[in-house]
């Protein structure tokens, strides 16, 4: 059986980022995103 291994030679770090909804609209509360490799993806 073939074994597939991802080895790019570097780690991809991720970090949770929290923004206030008020800063981008009229809603209240927090917006949570995920930054992976320097890009916010969610």
């Amino acid at each position: 059986d073939a074994e597939f291994r991802h080895d790019s030679g570097y780690e991809v770090h991720h970090q949770k980022l929290v923004f206030f909804a008020e800063d981008v609209g009229s809603n209240k509360g927090a917006i949570i995103g995920l930054m992976v490799g320097g890009v916010v993806i969610a």
């Epitope: 970090q15 980022l17 923004f19 206030f20 008020e22 209240k28 927090a30």
Partner: nanobody, 124 residues
Amino acid sequence: EVQLLESGGGLVQPGGSLRLSCAASGRTFNNYNMGWFRQAPGKGREFVAAVSRSGVSTYYADSVKGRFTISRDNAKNALYLQMNSLRPEDTAIYYCGAAYRGTAINVRRSYDSWGQGTLVTVSS
């Protein structure tokens, strides 16, 4: 940019309460989301809580949720952190910070103004 000055720290027994204050100078206080961070001996500065420019929205680190309450008074240019049910692991220097709108409020790099910190020690 605003200048910030914390107060209210001290020695408290486990299970006790403290209220931290942060006084801001400058007329632009309500342009900033405000946050509290803390730094325990030998550790990095970690996010505690933040409040939006209007004071309507708040966000807390999981470790303090349900025990700490952040609030602000824009008329007095003041930020507060009510800390209840304190634990020994809450021992740290507490810093208030100001972050521009639209920046992530849970990361240190978003904050461009800091106070000098106030020491909170939780010990019996």
